[in-house]
């Protein structure tokens, strides 16, 4: 058996700094939560303790605070690179500043792959955006490989500003051939990472043959097993188990929003890539977890421009 730890975030929405419990501006620092400096502390703690760890984001890093207003996505690329994310799926809000506002600050600057299998570029944009986002990526993890396939809400044209040269296809229709391709490449552990909401996440788990795990976003769904640690009321257990049409138990996870929690899912695979077991819970990033001083110093440096903007 081979064990993989999936750490995941979604719908962070520009909460680079720590926030209050309700994800608004931090007032009393001793009771604040989240933020990339605190997230980094926890991620590093887990990376040090466990051998096979992936850090994934399920979209909507863009939009939500003055950080995005001022930095327009450059802050996302910089701090996700600093935390060494392994992959990200495109969310609808990544298109809020148009395709150019996605390409220049994020797609060209991210060191990690940015994914979506159901977004197809056409016309003059096709060559411009080619290779900057991918339908899937095969990630080496220790001595194994894991395939990550991305997806994005097909409602994005009605929710954001992707323009006329991007086609948002049906998620399930688009995902299946990409998963099939991964199988032909002998990739037998596949994660669907995307931003279409919990209902679609469950459908993907049910309908897309070969998907082993679904890591989602968009609906800000909070899942938890046991007594929840803060105010969020769980919509179900973590992970939420879906029985696929071909009889497999597929774990589906999401980690609320605003960087308040870090999703933590441990998956055990057999030698054929079948999921043997899955367990975990979102980790509440409260003040018991110190902010990493180095990332915090970097945040403070970037903060200066925001203070100038505010005055």
């Amino acid at each position: 058996a081979w064990e993989l730890t999936i750490l995941h975030t979604n719908d962070v929405h520009s909460r680079l700094e720590q926030t209050s419990e309700d994800s608004s501006k931090c007032v009393n620092a001793s009771r604040c939560m989240g933020g990339v400096a605190r997230l980094f502390t926890k991620v590093q703690q887990i990376r040090r303790a466990e051998p096979n760890v992936l850090l994934l984001d399920a979209g909507d890093q863009y939009q939500g605070t003055i950080w995005f207003t001022v930095y327009k996505g450059a802050e996302v690329a910089h701090f996700m690179n600093a935390l060494r994310y392994d992959a990200m799926a495109l969310g609808n809000h990544e298109f809020d500043n148009g395709v150019e506002g996605l390409i220049e600050p994020l797609l060209k600057e991210a060191k990690f792959p940015i994914l979506s299998a159901n977004i197809k570029a056409k016309g003059p944009l096709a060559s411009q955006i080619s290779g900057l986002y991918l339908p899937y990526k095969v990630l080496p993890v220790g001595d194994e490989v894991v395939g990550i396939v991305g997806y994005t809400s097909k409602e994005t044209p009605f929710l954001s500003n992707p323009g006329t040269n991007l086609v948002f296809e049906d998620e399930i229709t688009a995902l299946q051939p990409e998963v099939d391709k991964l199988k032909t490449l002998n990739v037998n552990k596949i994660i669907a990472l995307g931003h279409s909401g919990f209902e679609m996440d469950k459908l993907i788990a049910q309908k897309v043959r070969g998907v082993d795990v679904v890591v989602g976003g968009h609906s800000n769904t909070f899942l938890y097993t046991g007594n929840p640690p803060s105010k969020e009321v769980p919509a179900g257990k973590y992970p939420f188990i879906v029985t696929s049409d071909d009889g497999r138990k597929v774990p589906v996870v999401q980690a609320y929003a605003f960087g308040k929690y870090l999703g933590y899912l441990k998956i055990e695979f057999d030698e054929r890539g079948n999921v043997i077991s899955s367990h975990g819970n979102p980790i509440l990033l409260n003040s018991s977890i110190p902010e990493d001083p180095s990332i915090k110093a970097d945040i403070n440096k970037w903060r200066i421009k925001l203070d100038n903007y505010s005055t």
């Epitope: 990376r47 060191k111 990630l139 080496p140 220790g142 001595d143 490989v145």
Partner: antibody, heavy 121, light 107 residues
Framework: QVQLVESGGGVVQPGRSLRLSCAAS????????MHWVRQAPGKGLEWVAV????????YYADSVKGRFTISRDNSKNTLFLQMNSLRAEDTAVYYC??????????????WGQGTMVTVSS | DIQMTQSPSSLSASVGDRVTITCRAS??????LAWYQQKPEKAPKSLIY???SLQSGVPSRFSGSGSGTDFTLTISSLQPEDFATYYC?????????FGGGTKVEIK
């Protein structure tokens, strides 16, 4: 067990070329970034070059840029360093070292035993 | 390029001593720092990664700390086999750079 074995070192005249090899065993070679690090006699360690797990990207130290080329053959579990226009200051023990599984810079957890390259007329 | 400055360049100590070696980066490198041990005519050996994580098989008398620009390698109780040269290395960004080394000798 996990092992890296360098070969190809020797004595070479300035301006000439040499090709170093590093044979890997005991791990999934195609999953790891691989590096060359050198150490001049009596000196400290100097990083030379890296190649990503899939060969997709390569980075070099300024001191060797344009003269050295790192490459890999994942089907043969072998790393290479092609050294052209060699100079006296390239004299060193050359180590291959295993990095991480991603595209981020990484530390080295496994080192080869090294191969000596002497550039002298 | 990020410069790594190690101090001291050499030190003399006795078996059982607590030994501390420091490494300073010319700019912030978060916790992307490793420590290596090298004995004469041998390849370096990895001791610590991510500033404070012990490589498997490394004795617990070795420990690392620090973040940002200032880092420390500590040997809590020096053993005969610990006499060697120690190097720090940043892996925050390319080009990867090493400190100049600290030679730990027998007093």
């Amino acid at each position: 067990q996990v092992q890296l074995v360098e070969s190809g070192g020797g004595v070479v005249q300035p301006g000439r070329s040499l090709r170093l090899s590093c044979a890997a065993s005991g791990f999934t070679f195609s999953n790891y970034g691989m590096h060359w690090v050198r150490q001049a006699p009596g000196k400290g360690l100097e990083w030379v070059a890296v190649i990503w797990y899939d060969g997709g990207n390569k980075y070099y130290a300024d001191s060797v840029k344009g003269r050295f080329t790192i490459s890999r053959d994942n089907s043969k579990n072998t790393l290479f360093l092609q050294m052209n226009s060699l100079r006296a200051e390239d004299t060193a023990v050359y180590y291959c070292a295993r990095g991480g599984s991603s595209w981020y810079p990484d530390a080295f957890d496994i080192w080869g035993q090294g191969t000596m390259v002497t550039v002298s007329s | 390029d990020i410069q790594m400055t190690q101090s001291p360049s050499s030190l003399s100590a006795s078996v059982g001593d607590r030994v501390t070696i420091t490494c300073r980066a010319s700019q912030g490198i978060s916790s992307w720092l490793a420590w290596y041990q090298q004995k004469p005519e041998k390849a370096p050996k990895s001791l610590i990664y991510a500033a404070s994580s012990l490589q498997s098989g490394v004795p617990s008398r070795f420990s690392g700390s620090g973040s940002g620009t200032d880092f420390t390698l500590t040997i809590s109780s020096l053993q005969p086999e610990d006499f060697a040269t120690y190097y720090c290395q940043q892996y925050n960004s390319y080009p990867l750079t090493f400190g100049g080394g600290t030679k730990v000798e027998i007093k």
